[in-house]
């Protein structure tokens, strides 16, 4: 199947890659640069101009060009300047600023907590199944199976540290070799990048915002997939990661130190442990074929236990199993002996919500999954709203310049590497790459950070999470120290290798181009984002898993033709864009194939048919919510709520009313003015920090 043309061509000019993009003549020819292009490229784009005579906004003198959807929106100020405020206004403004900061930190806190709870929920829903994935004996011989198991388990438990710790315990107990563990670690690296992709989906309401957010999130996915694509075959052929890490581990005489620091968890744990607490050892025990663990609940009930070494009478199958001949007897039915056993006495129950409900893991998991996703979504929306109101004017300018500006000329190349260090440092502080990249996603969406800058930050995040793992390994007990350190180092060098592949030379920064391509498609066909998630994180890994279980012949038999077709399509795509004359006329484009094989338009029509019945009730509800939201936060009446309001949007566009979300609008005053709803800025609501 040929690729959809949108994927390969992430170019600055949207008309080059957007299907059926048409343009009407500008109203005022001399100022044709000013466009307010709607996201919906299916209908003619209305370009309009705000004539100075109608405008109350004095902030904008030159109309800005927004042709490139990847250009960051200018979040401009519509408030009264600080110098123009009276004492009361200044005090009010300071309190407003403090209030916003507290709210922002509060929502950020609950956002991080909800990610933690989401991880627990996934573990409750799929943790035991994930554990059973690991107990598959084929992992040893099949690196591809190891890779997909790493992906699937991490996706199911929503935590690479959980899957990594299972691998460590399996290596430590000789159930798995380091060689077999490396592909699993690579898979875990891929699996962990699903979290921020899910977070990006929460910004689906606004096309341009979603375009940036989704591309910013998937840049992580593409980096991981591409790294594996190159480094897994290299590792299978040379075992360089295994060899290098073994040399490092053997050259140091490590002494296991104290516990690794729990930086962010110190703040979030008190709250999350009131929601649910999990006994993560159960998943590891299942992975290690412990039959007793299969019936154990993951929900921790007893938090305070007393472990005592005592001589205990235990039954044995025969006299031969007795600890000593003198310590053996029968009660007429069973044979008993005395053994030194560690006896665990339950002292105090945990203090979380589910401790006394005795619900099955699946039920608790589903409840937490729904709640955490709702909280995650709510917090994200509020964070975006608060940031949108805070990041205006000079504040936005300062932040955007700080984050996105390069160093002066000879050292410009160093900026990206500093960003990598910042990403690593921040991830080390929050102790989770998922948390860091998920926090980054809305910032990319609202246009504070460019994708070009988010990319090295994400790469740094990958490094940061491995340094955390190395620290945790150094703090692990003697019996697991070697294996956990070697695996943590494998993870570290894998990410370093990936960075060396896909960062230093600008030309090799393929993940950015691929993410932008996907961002363009997803902005136009929003269903494709979910389609991408399902395909890349579930369908492909599960297919490979199934084929691997069927054996090498089946895997090769199916895999080779598929890989061959993909390579053929990519080569053809490359020739079509670079030197089409080399190709026969028929192959210079994809028109020789049925439309459904090279365009998403027919698929969109099919999906619209299926989702059609759900759109109207959703739309009514959405409009009500939208109006309430507009009343509360002063957004324009026609703000976009979701894809299901498309009919409304198109109707308004036909009347010349632009439909834009306030966050991506240059100026709130302008957006109101465009609808003939001009009002003077209210000193109570509009406030500039600088």
């Amino acid at each position: 199947m040929a690729p959809w043309p949108e994927l390969g061509d992430a170019q600055p000019n949207p008309s080059k890659y957007l299907e059926g993009a048409t343009s009407q003549q500008p109203i005022t020819p001399d100022k044709s640069k000013e466009t307010n292009k709607t996201d919906n490229t299916e209908v003619p784009v209305t370009k309009f101009e705000l004539l100075p005579t109608y405008s109350t906004a004095t902030l904008i003198e030159e109309p800005t060009e927004v042709d490139d959807p990847w250009n960051l929106p200018t979040l401009q100020d519509s408030g009264i300047k600080w110098s123009e405020r009276d004492a009361k206004g200044k005090i009010l403004c300071v309190f407003q600023g403090i209030g916003r900061l507290i709210l922002l930190l509060g929502f950020l806190y609950f956002f991080v907590c909800s990610l933690d709870v989401l991880s627990s929920a996934f573990q409750l829903v799929g943790g035991k199944m994930a554990g059973q994935f690991f107990s598959n004996s084929s992992i040893m011989s099949n690196p591809l199976l190891g890779l997909v198991i790493g992906v699937l388990v991490t996706v199911f438990v929503q935590s690479s540290s959980t899957s990594t710790s299972i691998v460590v315990s399996m290596v430590a107990s000789s159930l798995l070799t380091v060689r077999a563990a490396i592909p699993i670690i690579m898979g875990a690296n891929i699996g962990t990048s699903i979290t921020n992709t899910i977070v990006a989906l929460m910004q689906v309401g606004d096309r341009s915002e979603f375009r940036r957010a989704f591309a910013g999130a998937t840049v992580h996915d593409f980096f991981n997939w591409l790294s594996v694509l190159v480094l897994l075959p290299v590792e299978v052929a040379t075992h360089y990661l295994e060899v290098v890490t073994q040399l490092i581990v053997e050259s140091f005489h490590f002494k296991n130190g104290e516990d690794a620091p729990d930086l962010l968890k110190v703040i979030t744990k008190p709250f999350t442990k009131l929601i649910v607490q999990l006994d993560k050892k159960v998943i590891s025990q299942i992975a290690m074929n412990d039959e007793t663990a299969k019936n154990k609940s993951l929900v921790k009930i007893w938090c305070k236990t007393f472990t005592n070494m005592t001589q205990m009478n235990v039954t044995v199958p025969s006299m031969a199993n007795c600890t000593s001949p003198s310590l053996c007897w029968t009660d007429g039915i069973q044979i008993w002996t005395m053994k030194n056993v560690t006896y665990k006495e339950n002292i105090a129950k945990c203090q979380h919500i589910f401790v006394n409900f005795h619900l099955p893991d699946l039920a608790v998991g589903i409840i937490l999954l729904i709640i955490s996703l709702l909280v995650l979504c709510g917090c994200l929306i509020m964070i975006v709203k608060i940031l949108g109101s805070v990041l205006k004017g000079q504040v936005a300018t300062v932040i955007k310049k700080t984050i996105n500006t390069d160093f002066p000329f000879p050292f410009a190349w160093l900026t990206g590497y500093l960003a990598i260090l910042v990403g690593a440092g921040m991830t080390f502080i929050v102790q989770s790459s998922s948390v860091f990249t998920s926090a980054l996603t809305p910032l990319i969406g609202i246009g504070v950070i460019t994708i070009e800058r988010a990319y090295p930050l994400t790469l740094g995040s990958n490094i940061g999470t491995t340094t955390t793992a190395i620290l945790a390994a150094l703090a692990s007990p003697g019996n697991t120290l070697r294996s956990s350190l070697q695996i943590a180092l494998c993870h570290f060098f894998f990410n370093i290798s990936g960075i060396l592949l896909w960062y230093p030379i600008p030309f090799t920064r393929l993940p950015i181009r691929m993410a932008k391509g996907l961002g363009n498609i997803s902005a136009k066909y929003r269903w494709f984002a979910i389609f991408y998630l399902i395909i890349f994180f579930f369908l492909i890994p599960l297919t490979v898993f199934g084929l691997s279980l069927a054996g090498w012949p089946v895997l090769v038999g199916v895999g080779v033709p598929v890989v061959f077709i993909i390579i053929l399509v990519l080569c053809l795509r490359l020739l079509q864009s670079r030197c089409p004359r080399v190709l026969p006329k028929k192959l210079q484009n994809w028109n020789f194939l049925p439309l459904c094989m090279h365009s998403l338009k027919p698929w969109d029509a099919v999906i619209s048919k299926f989702t059609g019945p759900f759109q109207m009730p959703c739309c009514c509800c959405c409009r009500v919510c939208c109006r309430v939201c507009c009343l509360l936060c002063g957004c324009p009446k026609c703000c976009r709520c979701s894809k299901c309001c498309q009919d409304l949007e198109e109707g308004q566009e036909a009347q010349g009313v632009p439909v834009k979300a306030p966050e991506t609008f240059d100026n709130i005053t302008i957006s109101r003015e465009a609808q003939g709803e001009v009002r003077a800025p209210d000193s109570k609501t509009e406030c500039t920090a600088l």
Epitope: N313, S326, L327, C328, T330, Q334
Partner: antibody, heavy 120, light 107 residues
Framework: QVQLVQSGAEVVKPGSSVKVSCKTS????????IHWVRQSPGQGLEWIGG????????NYKQNFRGRATLTADKSTSTAYMELSSLRSEDTAVYYC?????????????WGQGTTVTVSS | DIQMTQSPSSLSTSVGDRVTITCTAS??????VAWYQQKPGKSPKLLIY???TRHTGVPERFSGSGSGTDFTLTISSLQPEDVATYFC?????????FGGGTKVEIK
């Protein structure tokens, strides 16, 4: 206090069967094993078998296997011993005794005994 | 099955005398031996378990010793209420087996 109260004396015909009950009180029935021991007139003690009421696991002495059936009713904390195909040599006093499960203290409490007379 | 042989089968002695009853196992039973007292017309009562551990409420004049195959029950000072038949029992392996018994009488 700990009590094991057995059913009354039985006079039965050869070839028939007898069911002796042992009602317990004063302790957790499921935490113990109930053993059955018989004592023929002027003879020593002979172990018949035992049952773990908690899981109904039983064990019998070889020569009682197939003839003796041990059961336990957790709801009434009562153990039963049924002996079939009775012969004159089965005439004896049948005792039930408890043994603390997972412990080596032996049979620390006995019932008063049930006299079974096999006579035509 | 492990055979438990008790000796003597009966003994007659005076109040205050020291009484020793022995029990020999046909094979090594470690220390998995118990001693019971059965008074005429009554059910047996546990005296000693694990060869030498006195059961709750058993007077101190009763003591047990031995390991492997040879075991001893000692009554340091015979009392009139000690008139009974004494049985040893092994619980090293199944089936549980008892000794033939030793009848203790007072002259």
């Amino acid at each position: 206090q700990v009590q094991l109260v057995q059913s009354g004396a039985e006079v039965v015909k050869p070839g028939s069967s007898v069911k002796v009950s042992c009602k317990t009180s004063g302790f957790f029935f499921t935490e113990y094993i109930i053993h059955w021991v018989r004592q023929s007139p002027g003879q020593g003690l002979e172990w018949i078998g035992g049952i773990i009421p908690n899981n109904d696991v039983t064990n019998y002495k070889q020569n009682f296997r197939g003839r003796a059936t041990l059961t336990a009713d957790k709801s009434t904390s009562t153990a039963y011993m049924e002996l079939s195909s009775l012969r004159s040599e089965d005439t004896a006093v049948y005792y039930c005794a408890r043994w603390r499960n997972a412990y080596y203290s032996a049979m620390d409490s006995w019932g008063q005994g049930t006299t079974v007379t096999v006579s035509s | 099955d492990i055979q438990m042989t008790q000796s003597p089968s009966s003994l007659s002695t005076s109040v205050g005398d020291r009484v020793t009853i022995t029990c020999t196992a046909s094979q090594d039973v470690g220390t998995a031996v118990a001693w019971y007292q059965q008074k005429p017309g009554k059910s047996p009562k546990l005296l000693i378990y694990w060869a030498s551990t006195r059961h709750t409420g058993v007077p101190e004049r009763f003591s047990g010793s031995g390991s492997g195959t040879d075991f001893t029950l000692t009554i340091s000072s015979l009392q009139p209420e000690d008139v009974a038949t004494y049985f040893c029992q092994q619980y090293r392996t199944s089936p549980l087996t008892f000794g033939g018994g030793t009848k203790v009488e007072i002259k």
